[in-house]
Amino acid sequence: HNTTVFQGVAGQSLQVSCPYDSMKHWGRRKAWCRQLGEKGPCQRVVSTHNLWLLSFLRRWNGSTAITDDTLGGTLTITLRNLQPHDAGLYQCQSLHGSEADTLRKVLVEVLADPLDHRDAGDLWFPGESESFEDAHVEHSISRSLLEGEIPFPPTS
């Protein structure tokens, strides 16, 4: 799977879209999870309504919402009041029982609010000089990882 980068401004909302084949995933609930480390598990953040028929209803978990256009084949996740700690790697998933198929890998980048003059040193997003694997661009603001870029911030 390619990783698609979605950039949002701190304090604002970010909308992430995950297109999928609506016929292939017919009847399957969807979820949004956060990748814990490069090889770690993907921790569920929020999932669509228990009844697939009602997947269009927005479901919230804290500041994250999910809604699914099951006929059009687009899963939409909204991250409200985006914060620096929201930056990281996520997945859109299609569920079957306790297992899941990855629909899209997403890197969320949090940009400093240009109107906010506080120290933005804690806002992390990958530098353009770093290189990322499996890149492809899509704007939300979004882009794909550049070849060789790593989806996790460097740890000290």
Epitope: D21, M23, K24, W26, G27, S55, H96, S98
Partner: antibody, heavy 122, light 108 residues
Framework: EVQLVQSGAEVKKPGESLKISCKGS????????IGWVRQMPGKGLEWMGI????????RYSPSFQGQVTISADKSISTAYLQWSSLKASDTAMYYC???????????????WGQGTTVTVSS | EIVLTQSPGTLSLSPGERATLSCRAS???????LAWYQQKPGQAPRLLIY???SRATGIPDRFSGSGSGTDFTLTISRLEPEDFAVYYC?????????FGGGTKVEIK
């Protein structure tokens, strides 16, 4: 009319290879999963695996993983089940079936092929 | 994998009687993903019920399905001569999809 038509009965020797087919018609073949089901003589139904012809995504039952290969050629609306080396225990009736799309997100194998009898004997 | 256990193995009844077939799952299955099939000798299976309780196209209303979680039931309100067959439950909630072992409904 929506239908799945399977290839004819086969008689093979142990160790031989075999590929049986299932041709769909009357619907959009690429947008429905096609599953394969085994029924040994006098026994129940066993789910072998399933394929989505649109992108050839395939899932197998652990019991059949590595024993058979499921494939599809969407250009001719045909799914396949194949063995590289048959065993006497592969003697059975094999059915293909379509996983339907029902309102409310329900599935269910709504259209079945007529079945292909495979006999493996020395 | 999810194991489906059907009971009884054989049900001996007379035409006109009510048949109650059980299917128990080894772990919870969303009712959206439980189906019932009928199979007569020499024929391919036929879908009767999907989503645990919805009748497939052309299935008479004497067939009904119910249940949720781990316990599901297929009921034939009044057996007709053509209903004597083997019935299977099947789940497509998680991979691998699985069938129950079947219940044979035979004439008493």
């Amino acid at each position: 009319e929506v239908q799945l038509v399977q290839s004819g009965a086969e008689v093979k020797k142990p160790g031989e290879s075999l590929k049986i087919s299932c041709k769909g018609s009357g619907y959009s073949f690429t947008t429905y999963w096609i599953g394969w089901v085994r029924q040994m003589p006098g026994k129940g139904l066993e789910w072998m695996g399933i394929i989505y012809p649109g992108d050839s995504d395939t899932r197998y039952s652990p019991s059949f993983q590595g024993q058979v290969t499921i494939s599809a050629d969407k250009s001719i609306s045909t799914a396949y089940l194949q063995w590289s080396s048959l065993k006497a225990s592969d003697t059975a009736m094999y059915y293909c079936a379509r996983a339907g799309h029902y309102d409310g997100g329900h599935l269910g194998m709504d259209v079945w092929g007529q079945g292909t009898t495979v006999t493996v004997s020395s | 994998e999810i194991v489906l256990t059907q009971s009884p193995g054989t049900l001996s009844l007379s035409p006109g009687e009510r048949a109650t077939l059980s299917c128990r799952a080894s772990q919870s299955v969303s009712s959206d993903y439980l189906a019932w099939y009928q199979q007569k000798p020499g024929q391919a299976p036929r879908l009767l019920i999907y989503g645990a309780s919805s009748r497939a196209t052309g299935i008479p209303d004497r067939f009904s399905g119910s249940g949720s979680g781990t316990d599901f039931t297929l009921t034939i309100s009044r057996l007709e001569p053509e209903d004597f067959a083997v019935y299977y439950c099947q789940q497509d909630y998680s991979y691998p999809w699985t069938f129950g072992g079947g219940t044979k409904v035979e004439i008493k």
